[in-house]
């Protein structure tokens, strides 16, 4: 988990599909009641921006203490600031909660850069703009941290929505969503619509603007266009998926598909960028550079260090290619593709001294821990985390940023053989060899 890249770390038109579309079987199967339709009370319940994370309002304790909590599908702890910190406007005060229970256990979470540590306990938790339920959940009360909280981000904690396998200190600490499903009738599914602004937001604009929606327990039709296409969750730890092909402006990168998933591919709302394994990153950048060769940008731009600026309103989106990721489908030998625009992978940033320029950072970066489909990917799509059926759905987001010529797309089906071979099997430590 890297700070600045991984947070903390860590109106759309549907595209016409190429090839034959399955008869909407991925979108119209019978579902459990309450999982589909309108969730008005949860729409627009997220705020924030891709560079600093999207957060939801939650309440903790009795009487309820209101906090803004980063929505993170790349971790599994519910952890909140519980001591004064220069970047926190407010924090969880356990001593004021009559329902707080101390678990008498510490937790320490180091990142590549930075860390947080705290004390474990449980308390009553609810989501004001979520399902009308209260659950007793595990909470890590953060007492010390380094490079975790972000100045001006307006969130005070993190909601890890992934599986128990990656919870700290170990998988016996039940994650929040597991507790929610176990203690209520909320279906085992949530969906995210992250809405990138397409331009930099200052502090007051972030507070006033809508950042998107987290629909807990269902799917809201108003948040997407076209069909939902599902990819299997390969293993329940991170939200791990399998990428089977990558194209830049329709040109296949032609790599062994194992490279795309080395050592895993995950969907992570707590990461800003699309992060790619070294070899894949180098090939992708080479291809993007070639496609946009009418302009020469500094090497530092492609490494995420330098900005590129145009005079306001003159960004030549058309010189940058679209990027397509093909994901394993639910049917044998069938895949589908999700396509993002430069409006997703060029991240708008505030210029240091002038509002005359539109400036951008290249939001694709190199990874040593596999592919991370972060906010820049998710901002193009409505993403359904269907835990009950062990699958993740993608549809074109109704709020994705695009222009009059191109739109993000989710298209299929495509015939792809031997997709199972694209998954990388991380070597498991043989416990017996440690017993010497």
């Amino acid at each position: 988990t890297q700070h600045g890249i991984r947070l903390p770390l860590r109106s759309g038109l549907g595209g016409a599909p190429l090839g034959l579309r399955l008869p909407r079987e991925t979108d119209e199967e019978p579902e459990e009641p309450g999982r589909r339709g309108s969730f008005v009370e949860m729409v627009d319940n997220l705020r924030g921006k891709s560079g600093q994370g999207y957060y939801v309002e939650m309440t903790v304790g009795s009487p309820p203490q209101t906090l803004n909590i980063l929505v993170d599908t790349g971790s599994s702890n519910f952890a909140v600031g519980a001591a004064p910190h220069p970047f926190l406007h407010r924090y969880y005060q356990r001593q004021l909660s009559s329902t707080y229970r101390d678990l008498r256990k510490g937790v320490y979470v180091p990142y590549t850069q930075g860390k947080w540590e705290g004390e474990l306990g449980t308390d009553l938790v609810s989501i004001p703009h979520g399902p009308n339920v209260t659950v007793r959940a595990n909470i890590a009360a953060i007492t010390e941290s380094d490079k975790f909280f972000i100045n001006g981000s307006n969130w005070e904690g993190i909601l890890g929505l992934a599986y128990a396998e990656i919870a700290r200190p170990d998988d016996s600490l039940e994650p929040f969503f597991d507790s929610l499903v176990k203690q209520t009738h909320v279906p085992n599914l949530f969906s995210l619509q992250l809405c990138g602004a397409g331009f930099p937001l200052n502090q007051s604009e972030v507070l006033a603007s809508v950042g998107g929606s987290m629909i807990i327990g269902g799917i809201d039709h108003s948040l997407y266009t076209g069909s939902l296409w599902y990819t299997p969750i390969r293993r329940e730890w991170y939200y791990e998926v399998i990428i089977v092909r990558v194209e830049i402006n329709g040109q296949d990168l032609k790599m062994d598909c194992k490279e795309y998933n080395y050592d895993k591919s995950i969907v992570d709302s707590g990461t800003t960028n699309l992060r790619l394994p070294k070899k894949v990153f180098e090939a992708a950048v080479k291809s993007i550079k070639a496609a946009s060769s009418t302009e020469k940008f500094p090497d530092g731009f492609w490494l995420g260090e330098q900005l590129v600026c145009w005079q306001a309103g003159t960004t030549p989106w058309n010189i940058f290619p679209v990027i397509s990721l093909y994901l394993m489908g639910e049917v044998t030998n069938q895949s589908f593709r999700i396509t993002i625009l430069p409006q997703q992978y060029l991240r708008p940033v505030e210029d240091v001294a002038t509002s005359q320029d539109d400036c951008y950072k290249f939001a694709i970066s190199q990874s040593s821990t596999g592919t991370v489909m972060g906010a820049v990917i998710m901002e193009g799509f409505y993403v359904v985390f269907d835990r009950a059926r062990k699958r993740i759905g993608f549809a074109v987001s109704a709020c994705h940023v695009h222009d009059e010529f191109r739109t993000a797309a989710v298209e299929g089906p495509f015939v792809t053989l031997d997709m199972e071979d694209c998954g990388y099997n991380i070597p498991q430590t043989d416990e017996s060899t440690l017993m010497t």
Epitope: P298, Q306, A353
Partner: nanobody, 129 residues
């Protein structure tokens, strides 16, 4: 407008050292990104080092890593960047240019080359065998 002036070039024997300097004035932003480039006769210009003031980081081309080091001085509204070149080889012979981006941003409409808006005149480095 950022002004760049290189100095320190010359002729040196293989294995010898030279120190180039680039004085930059006229920055409008606190942060800056600068690059050292070189161009040998009949070859394309290549970046040999780049400096990012915000990150306090320097990157080097593989061909010079371990032999060239860059450092910087900030005084009196002028930034001076140095390129210390050790263990020089005949293939290091080229015109060396200093380039800069104000605010660590390449402003496309200002023009420039190789992703930099501002360029010095260049200084000749010749390494004889």
């Amino acid at each position: 407008q950022v002004q760049l002036q290189e100095s320190g070039g010359g002729t040196v024997q293989a294995g010898g050292s030279l120190r180039l300097s680039c004085a930059a004035s006229g920055y409008t932003y606190r942060s800056y990104c600068m690059g050292w480039f070189r161009q040998a006769p009949g070859k394309e210009r290549e970046e040999v080092a780049s400096i990012n003031s915000d990150q306090g980081s320097t990157r080097y081309a593989a061909s010079v890593k371990g032999r060239f080091t860059s450092s910087q001085d900030n005084a009196n509204n002028t930034v001076t960047v140095y390129l210390q070149m050790n263990s020089l080889k005949p293939e290091d012979t080229a015109i060396y240019y200093c380039a800069a981006n104000d605010g660590c941003a390449y402003r496309v409409y200002r023009g420039g080359a190789y992703g930099y808006n501002f360029w010095g005149q260049g200084t000749q480095v010749t390494v004889s065998s």
